[in-house]
Every structure is written in structure tokens, then in C-alpha cells.
Amino acid sequence: MMTGTIETTGNISAEKGGSIILQCHLSSTTAQVTQVNWEQQDQLLAICNADLGWHISPSFKDRVAPGPGLGLTLQSLTVNDTGEYFCIYHTYPDGTYTGRIFLEVLESSVAEHGARFQIP
């Protein structure tokens, strides 16, 4: 039975040219996290394997930095980076948990963080 929940940074906004940290946290389960995949719609951004380390997709290697922790840092943001991002937690024995973050990249300097929310 999957008892865990994923807490994410929720809906966030950031300035064009700036950077943002995408962060998820898995709680309420003793399952072992074996891997976290970071994906944007149909694209793979990065993989963090608990044992083997990080894989960064070459399409994003100049703009994505691993961490902090299991999170992902997006740099040199463009308006095209606006959209949904998913953290996919592969765990044993529970299986897969998915968290969603919506990022809006703004032209203006008015960029405020949204509230945190949970996805069961």
C-alpha cells in the first residue's frame, strides 16, 4: 500500500534570465527512494539515481545543475521554460510517486513564489 505523499514547491514564478530550484520531498513512507526522474511534459531533464549519481540530458546540460539534494536547479530561464515539471520518485517497495510543479517565467521583475501544496 502506498502511504507516502509528495510535497512540492507548487506553482512558482521566476524572472527571465534568472534561476529557480525545483524541489520535491517524499514523506509519510519508509520506502527507499532508488531514483528520482525530473521531466518536463514529454522531455527528460535529469535522473538522480541514489547509487549511480546524476544523468543530465544533453539538451539541458548548459542550463540545468543537479541539486540541492534530489532537487534540480534551472538556470538562464527563458519564457519557453514556462510549463509543468514533474518529479517522479521511484521507490522500493512502494512503487512510483509523482509530484507536479508549475513554473511561470515572467518578463517583468515581479516574480513571487507560490504556496507549497501536497499531492497524495
Epitope: 535522473i47 547509487d51 549511480l52 549519481g53 543530465i56
Partner: antibody
């Protein structure tokens, strides 16, 4: 230049163990994950597992968990793969390979070590 | 485990031919696929990584495409040194798995 040089061919009896070594040179050993892949005669490639010398973490194909042990000696930039309780179907060429920095493909391979299990 | 199924398992072609090898994953693996070339008695060599990126020193006649579950390796004009066996590999999830191989033979 990057080189992965493996130990020589081995002939073992069923039930025995074998330890294959892979000496790395031409790159910073601790910054790359070392993997082991085997190929039975006339067959395809099978991933055994990988060892990250930086973190000390290792990931195994469940098929080999409990029989395969991956280790490294950082002082001599050498990776090892030990396979115990050998069976005849473990007869194969065993390759070490390096995964690229921040990539999970295998960009450099050793020359292979033939392990023959026969009574 | 994720299964990688290559087709065809073997093919005969002539120098100068355009050759296409396909690889189908049993589930979505995004672009986490590499292609290798192996010649008899030798270790595999990396050709393509992350589905479509040509590895350093690999001739431009080799190209990779696809995402999700369907991937293709194309050799635009087969050369004598290209007769070999080709493998796809997924690294989306451990255990990493390979296709069964496609042997490209001289017609």
C-alpha cells in the same frame, strides 16, 4: 588517453568464485561510475551493475544480487567484479565500462575478460 | 525490468545502402537510450547517446532519433567498416537493459 585494462582469462569450476579487475587510466577515477556488463557466447549484452567510487554507492541487476560484488580500490584506480557460486551459464566475456560525467551511457569499455565455467 | 526489442535481428545490405534499425521499449523511457556498435571479438563502442546525440568521433552517417518507446538508428550510407552488430540500451531505470542486437551483414 582513457584506458580500461582488464585482467586475463579465467577457467573456473562450478560453485567457485571469480574476481575480475579493471585498471583505469587517463581520467580522474573517482569522478566516473564503473559498470560491468557481460556477454555469453553468441548472445547479447547484460548489465550486471555499477559502482560509484565517489559516493561508494552500488547498483545491481537483481538477477546478480547476492552473487555479484562490485568494489574499487581508489588508490590504484581499479574496479573489481567478483561473481560467486559460478554456474556453467556464467560462461561469458565480462566487460568493465565507464559511464560519462553526468551521463548514463557507457563511453569507454575494457577489452573484456573471458570467464569459462566448466567441470 | 524494461524490455528493449530490436528489429530486425539481422539484415543484409550493400555498401552505400541506407540502413535503419529500430528499438522498442516496453515502457516510456523518454530519451534515455544509447546505441552501440560491436565487432566480433571486440568491446562495444558508443555511437549515440540520449537517443539523438552523436558521440565524439562518430561519423555523421550515423544518426539516432525517437523518444518515448520507439527509437531508430540510421546509417545513411553503409561503409565496409560498418558491418557489425548494433545494440540499443535504456538507462531510464535500473536495471539498465539492452536490446538483443541487430547484425548487419554484407549482401
Amino acid at each position: 588517453q582513457v584506458q580500461l585494462v582488464q585482467s586475463g582469462a579465467e577457467v573456473k569450476k562450478p560453485g567457485a568464485s571469480v574476481k575480475v579487475s579493471c585498471k583505469a587510466s587517463g581520467f580522474t577515477f573517482t569522478e566516473y561510475t564503473m559498470h560491468w556488463v557481460r556477454q555469453a557466447p553468441g548472445q547479447g549484452l547484460e548489465w550486471i551493475g555499477g559502482f560509484n567510487p565517489n559516493s561508494g554507492g552500488s547498483s545491481y541487476n537483481q538477477k546478480f544480487k547476492g552473487r555479484a560484488t562490485l568494489t574499487v580500490d581508489k588508490s590504484i584506480s581499479t574496479a573489481y567484479m567478483e561473481l560467486s557460486r559460478l554456474r556453467s551459464d556464467d560462461t561469458a566475456v565480462y566487460y568493465c565500462a565507464r559511464s560519462s560525467y553526468y551521463r548514463f551511457d557507457l563511453d569507454y569499455w575494457g577489452q573484456g575478460t573471458t570467464v569459462t565455467v566448466s567441470s | 525490468d524494461i524490455q528493449m526489442t530490436q528489429s530486425p535481428s539481422s539484415l543484409s545490405a550493400s555498401v552505400g545502402d541506407r540502413v535503419t534499425i529500430t528499438c522498442k521499449a516496453s515502457q516510456d523511457v523518454k530519451t534515455a537510450v544509447a546505441w552501440y556498435q560491436q565487432k566480433p571479438g571486440k568491446a562495444p563502442k558508443l555511437l549515440i547517446y540520449s537517443a539523438s546525440f552523436r558521440y565524439t568521433g562518430v561519423p555523421s552517417r550515423f544518426s539516432g532519433s525517437g523518444s518515448g518507446a520507439d527509437f531508430t538508428l540510421t546509417i545513411s550510407s553503409l561503409q565496409p567498416e560498418d558491418f557489425a552488430t548494433y545494440y540499443c540500451q535504456q538507462h531510464y531505470l535500473t536495471p539498465w537493459t539492452f536490446g538483443q542486437g541487430t547484425k548487419v551483414e554484407i549482401k
